[in-house]
Amino acid sequence: AVFDIHVVYVTTTEMWLDWKSPDGASEYVYHLVIESKHGSNHTSTYDKAITLQGLIPGTLYNITISPEVDHVWGDPNSTAQYTRPSNVSNIDVSTNTTAATLSWQNFDDASPTYSYCLLIEKAGNSSNATQVVTDIGITDATVTELIPGSSYTVEIFAQVGDGIKSLEPGRKSFCTDPASMASFDCEVVPKEPALVLKWTCPPGANAGFELEVSSGAWNNATHLESCSSENGTEYRTEVTYLNFSTSYNISITTVSCGKMAAPTRNTCTTGITDPPPPDGSPNITSVSHNSVKVKFSGFEASHGPIKAYAVILTTGEAGHPSADVLKYTYEDFKKGASDTYVTYLIRTEEKGRSQSLSEVLKYEIDVGNESTTLGYYNGKLEPLGSYRACVAGFTNITFHPQNKGLIDGAESYVSFSRYSDAVSLPQDPGVICG
């Protein structure tokens, strides 16, 4: 009799068997019948081992071994063994952010009887591989719960029968798609032509971001450093060298593994600052012994729309005015508290029209006509007085909460024209006649 038939190794087309027989008789002939669904084959050997060749991959073989000595046949013994399936090939992967659909091919005749074992391993994390086994004859699988923007390796073994696997797996590296940034916020930088962009890192891995900033014909593309989504940190970057009070289209695209996510877009407008001071000074002309006419051109709106103008008069030295003079009124001037005061205020939005950047409006103000604008009284001027005029332009005008109607110069965005030449008022005709 033959016992302990042992399959030493098996490949796709070969099988090496050995066995034992009860006595040490060397004159035994061992007759082998090799059967499969493709037919049967006979061979003999004097050895207690044999290598069967020319087999078909993934096929179940029944091998029956009968000993024979001097034409006397002993009891046969059998074993059943599959050859290994061929390796899979042509692995194709299609991905989204958290899943990969894999398909592959196996060209063996027996492939309809194969199932496939997939091992999916995240790069740098071999301890946590995911295993998927397909149903018989299925050559595709979808793996879910993957991490966006991450690198994976998949190994696919063909298997048949009781877990007889292909010698080598088919291998493929792939990356999941990076996740888009959910959104980002823009913040203006006070008095700077810049924007601060803020975002939380998208889930998964990233190599960085592409930032695109565009306004009209101007555009700029830059890279941003990578971020980590693990601790929910808010990330920020400052976009500089922009224009004030300008609308920008901004796009941020996540990049990982050489892949780009769908861009996340936002439209943001830069802040404002003090208007650029005008080159010229207002024109002042005497109208009567107690009034003058002040003519000036509107300030350039490149630092933000001009919200208001204040006409300032002084009888003193014509130094460069500061925001401090905005608190003085006609009453202060009359009391001698200041030789400079605000006589008239123009709120430009009250004119019911918007001013474009290039549009320069002309203004003509009657000073001394006893009108009142907010907290400022446009009182009569002093006969024989010598007056200069200056104009303050505001992109942001803030009023003192306690001094109703008076401008808070420190909180406002303001710049000043130069003072005009002095104009001397005539004597009051009533005094001459009187």
Epitope: T253, G258, P263
Partner: antibody, heavy 117, light 107 residues
């Protein structure tokens, strides 16, 4: 699998025009920054032009500025390079490529442009 | 423009040897440095981007290092299929620029 296939190259006289195309498949074309890179025979590589995904902003090397125009048609997943006023120094194999974070990741097989009278 | 200076111009190596190619940027480019391999009559292939991550499918015997202005590409255990021209390229600032190339041959 990312696939980029350039076409439109050929022999052209100096001063004439040529339009190259690059048909993209296997990825979401509209998400990607794209570029053209060229290589003169037996020479090194030279970046030519670049177009973004968000607003289609374009960038060019100085020697082609005003003569070449890069554009894209996201609906057709196609990148273009309109080359006008061609010069002998523009003769090269032109490759289209995806360009995340300034790296030319996927390349086409290239299309040869010959400029000669 | 940022100049990329690659050394050496050409290089011979035996099977199994380790080789290094250096790339020097004329100004700081952070880690926006890529390495490419080009074989005769073929398109360039990305090997390494952002100074060190290997691109998908590139054998692990290739490695990149460096930051700022100095970068290097190392190929361990030289194989016949590693023959070709290797280029470095900065993607930090327009115009993106390439090194002149290093020709690697098997001795």
């Amino acid at each position: 699998e990312v696939k980029l296939v350039e076409s439109g190259g050929g022999l052209v006289q100096p001063g004439r025009s040529l339009k190259l195309s690059c048909a993209a498949s296997g990825f979401t074309f509209s998400n990607y920054y794209m570029a053209w890179v060229r290589q003169a025979p037996t020479k090194g590589l030279e970046w030519v032009a670049y177009i973004t995904n968000g607003f289609g902003s374009t960038y060019y090397r100085d020697s082609v500025k005003g003569r070449f125009t890069i554009s894209r048609d996201n609906a057709k997943s196609t990148l273009y390079l309109q080359m006008d006023s061609l010069r002998s120094e523009d003769a090269a194999t032109y490759y289209c490529s995806t360009v995340p974070l300034g790296a030319f990741v996927s390349w086409g097989q290239g299309t040869l442009v010959t400029v000669s009278s | 423009d940022i100049q990329m200076t690659q050394t050496p111009h050409s290089l011979s190596a035996s099977l199994g040897e380790t080789v290094s190619i250096e790339c020097l940027a004329s100004e700081g480019i952070s880690n926006y440095l890529a390495w490419y391999q080009q074989k005769p009559g073929k398109s360039p292939q990305l090997l390494i981007s952002y100074a060190n991550p290997l691109h998908d499918g590139v054998p692990s015997r290739f490695s990149g290092s460096g930051s700022g202005t100095q970068f290097s590409l190392k190929i361990r255990n030289m194989q016949p299929e590693d023959e070709g021209v290797y280029y470095c390229q900065q993607g930090y600032k327009f115009p993106y620029t390439f090194g002149a190339g290093t020709k690697l041959e098997l001795t």
